[in-house]
Interface confidence: medium
């Protein structure tokens, strides 16, 4: 994040940016930036594998939920969207695309349907779903 | 928006930021930045006037919907929140805090209740509500 004050002095801007303001990113063009993470919601319904491929093609991954505090904007997300959580049948655990295990108490997992993939729904819920069902999806890019 | 390439060369960073990536803002700390506008969702329920005062104290205004394209993140917002739209009884029009008139086809106005203020709901809907009813609210700051 570039200090607004530094950028101001650098470019000798007339407009005074308050010290409490800052830039967010960098993110792909027209993505949402929040607490230095980048998010994009894709309207087109794809299965989990196609959704993953779409995110990867944009140098991102499917949504990873790692912090209720840093990702509290997710509380307000309407509807259901693929996230990067998958079931590992060998050990029965749920893990993210990057191989990390789902931390306890982050998501309420609702395992009523058969499936090895998960939909994100508002208020930090994860609905287990068949990976081949088309759904909208959320891509995420964590800034360095 | 500061060109990622320019900032890269300026600070001689090792990490190469793609040309398509950019910074967003500036915004108040921990606000959502999208297409160079800043948004914050406030959980605390206040009436419309208190909500407006809260936004103003943060150098922002209540949400103004001006473009479905530039504000398409609002499609997926869960629940109902005060926005800066008010009814002008003298001429029967709806206008924003800055005095501009609500553009046609931007919001579907649903007059469920008697009132002169409006709640924003997902998919660009505006619900008419009594201004003194407490609700959560969205503040917005347009970057220069």
């Amino acid at each position: 994040i570039w200090s607004a004050v530094f950028l101001n002095s650098l470019f000798n801007q007339e407009v005074q940016i308050p010290l409490t303001e800052s830039y967010c990113g960098p993110c792909p063009k027209n993505w949402i930036c929040y607490k230095n993470n980048c998010y994009q919601f894709f309207n087109e319904s794809k299965n989990w594998y196609e959704s993953q491929a779409s995110c990867m093609s944009q140098n991102a991954s499917l949504l990873k939920v790692y912090s209720k505090e840093d990702q509290d904007l997710l509380k307000l997300v309407k509807s259901y969207h693929w996230m990067g959580l998958v079931h590992i049948p060998t050990n029965g655990s749920w893990q993210w695309e990057d191989g990390s295990i789902l931390s306890p108490n982050l998501l309420t997992i609702i395992e009523m349907q058969k499936g090895d993939c998960a939909l994100y729904a508002s208020s930090f819920k994860g609905y287990i779903e068949n990976c081949s069902i088309p759904n909208t999806y959320i891509c995420m890019q964590r800034t360095v | 928006i500061w060109s990622a390439v320019f900032l890269n060369s300026l600070f001689n960073q090792e990490v190469q930021i793609p040309l398509t990536e950019s910074y967003c803002g500036p915004c108040p700390k921990n606000w959502i930045c999208y297409k160079n506008n800043c948004y914050q969702f406030f959980n605390e329920s206040k009436n419309w006037y208190e909500s407006q005062a809260s936004c103003m104290s943060q150098n922002a205004s209540l949400l103004k919907v001006y473009s479905k394209e530039d504000q398409d993140l609002l499609k997926l917002v869960k629940s109902y929140h005060w926005m800066g739209l008010v009814h002008i009884p003298t001429n029967g029009s709806w206008q924003w805090e800055d005095g501009s008139i609500l553009s046609p086809n931007l919001l579907t106005i649903i007059e469920m209740q008697k009132g002169d203020c409006a709640l924003y709901a997902s998919s660009f809907k505006g619900y008419i509500e009594n201004c003194s009813i407490p609700n959560t609210y969205i503040c917005m700051q347009r970057t220069v």
């Epitope: 309407k78 509807s79 259901y80 609702i110 395992e111 009523m112 349907q113 058969k114 499936g115 939909l119 729904a121 208020s123 609905y127 287990i128 779903e129 068949n130 | 709901a121 997902s122 998919s123």
Partner: antibody, heavy 118, light 110 residues
Framework: QVQLVESGGGVVQPGRSLRLSCAAS????????MHWVRQAPGKGLEWVAV????????YYADSVKGRFTISRDNSKNTLYLQMNSLRAEDTAVYYC???????????WGQGTLVTVSS | QSVLTQPPSVSEAPRQRVTISCSGS????????VNWYQQLPGKAPKLLIY???LLPSGVSDRFSGSKSGTSASLAISGLQSEDEADYYC???????????FGGGTKLTVL
Amino acid sequence: QVQLVESGGGVVQPGRSLRLSCAASGFTFSSYAMHWVRQAPGKGLEWVAVISYDGSNKYYADSVKGRFTISRDNSKNTLYLQMNSLRAEDTAVYYCARYDNTRIFDYWGQGTLVTVSS
Amino acid sequence: QSVLTQPPSVSEAPRQRVTISCSGSSSNIGNNAVNWYQQLPGKAPKLLIYYDDLLPSGVSDRFSGSKSGTSASLAISGLQSEDEADYYCAAWDDSLNGYVFGGGTKLTVL
């Protein structure tokens, strides 16, 4: 197309048992959670129980807990409701309904009437 | 006594608009999706609205749902005689670990 057909209803005395069945067709039954919902004559809908796709998770309404058991046989595409210690207040039309993650009860059967009377 | 509260009946003239309310708590409506079902006389219920305000395919756009906090409402515009039915709101309840319905509202088209 999706079809759910309930059977097994009838007249039964208080304290006795009855088993309802719901035959499913037109979709992959083994992939979906299923519910039972009932409706007493002239009254509203009351949720009874739900079972996950593989039968590992079951939830019941307080009014039937300990008396009713929901189960399924995926090889037969059939959902069951075993009702023991029946009471007059269990008199109702019993519906089975398919659960979908996003739409909840998207398909319903036509119902089977259970009358508990001496 | 239902966990979700609905008015027992509403009535309105043809071509008018009617709204049916549904009141709950943070453990059901406040934190979970609200669905609405229509039950025509002598028929099984039919899904009318899901996830607060979404319409399943085949349902007329005269029906609309909304939710605010722990309350939800169903609006029907351009009322027709075939809309005469019982309408139920419903949601999962995190405290009860079960699905809860409203008591139902009988709509009469005058």
